[in-house]
């Protein structure tokens, strides 16, 4: 992790890096490694991609162990093949308003993420994509075998969608905070980011937090009850310690994780909060990192890898984060 020891490189020559990822010398000048990309965790040995103007942001001078690859101030963003200047806002699609900040893109949904519970007036609510409409809208399917005339038999009317208003005015500053992005890893420790100007100087800044949607080693499908297709929030039997690049959380946590489905849906965090976690490293150094903690998960068909990148990143995501 640090450069105090002798150089030890893997036996095979140089690693094969994915397209667009630079092959660079590690921070110790020892071995050739695939450079870490924007938003990934970095260390002294695992440097960020210098050809993309990235540097390892350790967050505070006290913490020199693990950082996040960050673009230098003013770095542009490449998004969907278009280059945007830092500070520039754009609409990635009719559903998302995005902002570029120092190489990172943060987006806010323009469509309502509202839910609808069944009622006599709308016994089988569904969100559907309608031709010519950007946002999904609620329709109320009627019961097939109903003969009684009443609220449950009403002809459905589609929703006039009101997007959530994520802004507020404060002392001549229009405060805007994007949603937390989806966790960069579907299992294990990853990074989630957002862009905000909710600070004393009203300047846009990037914030990041560690996140773990589920542990990689958990075989969650085994726990799905007979006749069910999903396990939304599996019970974690024992408290765990988080691990981060060789460092271990000081406290144990009875954390919640998201489950899995067997019918093609994916389960993602829905309501989360952000709390500081202290990690202790083998050399005794202690560092504090903000981390996402899951309150509730949602299982849905808008899975990462679907056509709309932000649909998969933000659908029912990070609802009502407290931090």
């Amino acid at each position: 992790q640090n450069c105090s020891g002798p150089c030890r490189c893997p036996a095979e020559q140089a690693p094969r890096c994915p397209a667009g990822v630079s092959l660079v010398l590690d921070g110790c000048g020892c071995c050739r490694v695939c450079a870490k990309q924007l938003g990934e965790l970095c260390t002294e040995r695992d440097p960020c991609d210098p050809h993309k103007g990235l540097f390892c942001d350790f967050g505070s001078p006290a913490n020199r162990k693990i950082g996040v690859c960050t673009a230098k101030d003013g770095a542009p963003c490449i998004f969907g093949g278009t280059v945007y200047r830092s500070g520039e806002s754009f609409q990635s699609s009719c559903k998302y308003q995005c902002t570029c900040l120092d190489g990172a893109v943060g987006c806010m949904p323009l469509c309502s993420m509202d839910v609808r519970l069944p009622s006599p007036d709308c016994p089988f609510p569904r969100r559907v994509k309608l031709p010519g409409k950007c946002c999904e809208e609620w329709v109320c399917d009627e019961p097939k075998d109903q003969t009684v005339v009443g609220p449950a038999l009403a002809a459905y009317r589609l929703e006039d969608t009101f997007g959530p208003d994520p802004t507020m005015i404060r002392a001549n500053c229009l405060v805007q905070t994007t949603e937390w992005s989806a966790c960069s890893k579907t299992c294990g420790m990853g990074i989630s980011t957002r862009v905000t100007n909710d600070n004393a100087s009203c300047r846009l800044e990037k914030q990041s937090r560690l996140c773990m949607v589920r542990p990689c080693e958990a075989d969650l499908e085994e726990n799905i009850k007979k006749g069910k297709k999903c396990i939304r929030t599996p019970k974690i039997s024992k408290p765990i310690k988080f691990e981060l690049s060789g460092c271990t959380s000081v406290k144990t946590y009875r954390a919640k994780f998201c489950g899995v489905c067997t019918d093609g849906r994916c389960c993602t965090p829905h309501r989360t909060t952000t709390l500081p976690v202290e990690f202790k490293c083998p050399d005794g150094e202690v560092m504090k990192k903000n981390m996402m903690f899951i309150k509730t998960c949602a299982c849905h068909y808008n899975c990462p890898g679907d056509n709309d990148i932000f649909e998969s990143l933000y659908y029912r995501k990070m609802y009502g984060d407290m931090a």
């Epitope: 509202d114 009403a154 002809a155």
Partner: antibody
Framework: EVQLQESGPGLVKPSQTLSLTCTVS????????VHWIRQHPGKGLEWIGV???????DYNAAFMSRVTISKDTSKNQVSLKLSSVTAADTAVYYC????????WGQGTTVTVSS | ETVVTQEPSLTVSPGGTVTLTCRSS?????????ANWVQQKPGQAFRGLIG???NRAPWTPARFSGSLLGGKAALTLSGVQPEDEAEYYC?????????FGGGTKLTVLG
């Protein structure tokens, strides 16, 4: 963000008509129904009635002869009118969204007194 | 007049399991009653937890589950937390109107 806000006079004279308005934001009242509920001091909840998304209404039989719920979709507002009030109508009045009564207003206190 | 009855009060220890029930005076509760469960914590607004018998609102933790048990609507809390201390009301639909239960005051010990 879904919000419901009740408003109206806090004091109504006996035999007069109590008029309250529920102003809604974050959803459309042409998509969701809105319920009126009241709570007497230290007591449980009493359902008054509902206006459904299509404009139909249903009322608690106890209020049937003197209650009217209507809506103005252009303003996203629902109103409650309760006529011939007595001291027994003194309560906190709430509006709530249909669908699990998921979102509620903070409530408005109405006192019936001369 | 239809009456909906709930336990006036229940007490549970943290980590324990408790079931709140909602009985109809005119027979068994069914899915056609669209049983709803509403929570009010001290000093806070009401909010719906469960709608349509068993559907959780997005903010409702997984430890809350709605079901039909022995002809009654039931709200089960597993692994009760101190913050679950609140007043819980059920509401049942009867073709043309809703009726609320009297409410259950849930106390979480210690």
């Amino acid at each position: 963000e879904v919000q419901l806000q009740e408003s109206g006079p806090g004091l109504v004279k006996p035999s007069q008509t109590l008029s309250l308005t529920c102003t809604v934001s974050g959803f459309s009242i042409s998509t969701f129904g809105v319920h009126w509920i009241r709570q007497h001091p230290g007591k449980g909840l009493e359902w008054i009635g509902v206006i459904w998304r299509r404009g139909g209404t249903d009322y608690n039989a106890a209020f049937m002869s003197r209650v009217t719920i209507s809506k103005d979709t252009s303003k996203n507002q629902v109103s409650l009118k309760l006529s011939s009030v007595t001291a027994a109508d003194t309560a906190v009045y709430y509006c709530a969204r249909d669908g699990g009564f998921d979102y509620w207003g903070q409530g408005t206190t109405v006192t019936v007194s001369s | 007049e239809t009456v909906v009855t709930q336990e006036p009060s229940l007490t549970v220890s943290p980590g324990g399991t408790v079931t709140l029930t909602c009985r109809s005076s005119i027979g068994a509760v069914t899915t056609s009653n669209y049983a709803n469960w509403v929570q009010q914590k001290p000093g806070q607004a009401f909010r719906g937890l469960i709608g349509g018998t068993s559907n959780r609102a997005p903010w409702t933790p997984a430890r809350f589950s709605g079901s039909l048990l022995g002809g009654k609507a039931a709200l089960t809390l597993s692994g009760v937390q101190p913050e679950d201390e609140a007043e819980y009301y059920c509401a049942l639909w009867y073709s043309t109107h809703y009726v609320f239960g009297g409410g259950t005051k849930l106390t979480v010990l210690g």
